[in-house]
């Protein structure tokens, strides 16, 4: 006899990444006919919903109007079907942006090179933190953490044109408040044509996401966000 | 934005009934959830009771489960909680929150899930 219900889904929208200050709505996605949602933070319960009517609906929405510190960390949720409850969501890492300082994002050799050349990428942020983040736009993106007192360096080794992309980089206060992004840099990986006709740069986020992040809630995006994200939370872990 | 003012609070005996209100400013008070919190001296604020927007969700703290009750009438911009079998330890200074949920069945059960705050009432359960 079944003890437990699948799991729901968890995620952010418009992202995980929220500025400070601004709006971010958790979803949560269970089965028709859970009677009740509960969503937790850091281990607490936070909040419940309880759906009407619960056999029409199998998502709920938890707004956070003004996202600050104290509103990011780690967020889980479970849904009960009559007495019976799900296993909880994987963890939603929400992360708060903006934070105090903007970095400085810079590339050696520079930001035009040739398939095969050796490129590093270093961030620099001169307030108290030790840990930095760079991150690719795309949905199959990476993060990539690093360490220093005031700037992290990021060798990618020998690229090639997967490479080519649009890069930012944060300064890390802990793992759920960051500093505000560095300015983009775009990393153009020369090759030759058959190279760069079967590595097409990743897909990417609107071009509203790095800066405003998606200020709306009605994006409708999370579904393709959902890889990128989950990649980028494994490494917060 | 909305302006949050308790009432009710008092001195009562162990045993003993009250009831605090929580009145509301503005026309939209049917598009917030209400919560009741309470802080009791040298403690931290607590979670007591919590109503959605359309009164159909209502969740307790479990030391107050059975004992109190949480309502509202949206047409007097009032959320109340009506205590029974008061004790001692329901001594603490109650306050009223509000937010604004997308869903009209949420409630907040975290402090940190509310945007206004009354100023709060005092209730004394003496033994």
């Known amino acids: 006899q079944q003890q437990t219900l699948p799991k729901p889904f968890i995620w952010a929208e418009p992202h995980f990444m929220v500025p400070k200050e601004k709006q971010v709505t958790i979803c949560c996605q269970g089965n028709y006919g859970a009677v009740e949602y509960q969503l937790h933070f850091e281990g607490s319960l936070f909040a419940v919903d309880r759906p009407k009517p619960p056999e029409r609906i199998n998502k709920v929405q938890f707004y956070i109007p003004d996202m600050n510190s104290r509103m990011a960390g780690q967020y889980s949720c479970i849904y009960r079907v009559g007495e019976l409850w799900s296993e909880p969501s994987n963890l939603l890492d929400l992360v708060v942006t903006e934070m105090y300082d903007t970095p400085t994002l810079s590339v050696h050799p520079g930001p035009e090179v040739i398939s095969g050349e050796k490129v590093t990428f270093y961030c620099r942020l001169d307030t108290a933190t030790s840990m930095f983040l760079l991150l690719k736009e795309g949905r199959s993106s990476h993060v990539q953490r690093g360490y220093g007192k005031v700037q992290a360096e990021f060798p990618l080794g020998p690229v090639t044109t997967a490479h080519r992309g649009t890069y930012r980089c944060f300064g890390s206060y802990n793992n759920h408040a960051w500093s505000f992004p560095s300015e983009p840099v775009k990393l153009l990986v020369t090759g030759d044509i058959e190279n760069t006709s079967l590595a097409p740069e990743d897909p990417t986020f609107p071009a509203d996401t790095w800066g405003t992040y998606l200020l709306t809630t009605e994006t409708g995006l999370q579904k393709d966000h959902a890889l990128w994200d989950h990649t980028a939370q494994n490494l917060l872990r | 934005q909305v302006q949050l003012v308790e009432s009710g609070g008092g001195l009562v005996q162990a045993g003993d009934s009250l009831r605090v209100s929580c009145a509301a400013s503005?026309?939209?008070?049917?598009?917030?959830?209400m919560g009741w919190f309470r802080q009791a001296p040298g403690k931290e604020r607590e979670f007591v009771a919590a109503?959605?927007?359309?009164?159909?969700?209502?969740y307790y703290a479990d030391s107050v489960k059975g004992r109190f009750t949480i309502s509202r009438d949206n047409a007097k911009n009032t959320v109340y909680l009506q205590m029974n079998s008061l004790k001692p330890e329901d001594t603490a200074v109650y306050y009223c929150?509000?937010?604004?949920?997308?869903?009209?069945?949420?409630?907040?059960?975290?402090?940190?899930?509310?945007?206004?705050w009354g100023q709060g009432t005092q209730v004394t359960v003496s033994s």
């Open positions: 109503s959605s927007r359309d009164g159909t969700t209502t």
């Open positions: 929150a509000a937010s604004r949920p997308l869903s009209t069945t949420q409630v907040g059960i975290a402090s940190a899930w509310y945007e206004y």
């Open positions: 503005g026309r939209t008070f049917s598009t917030y959830a």
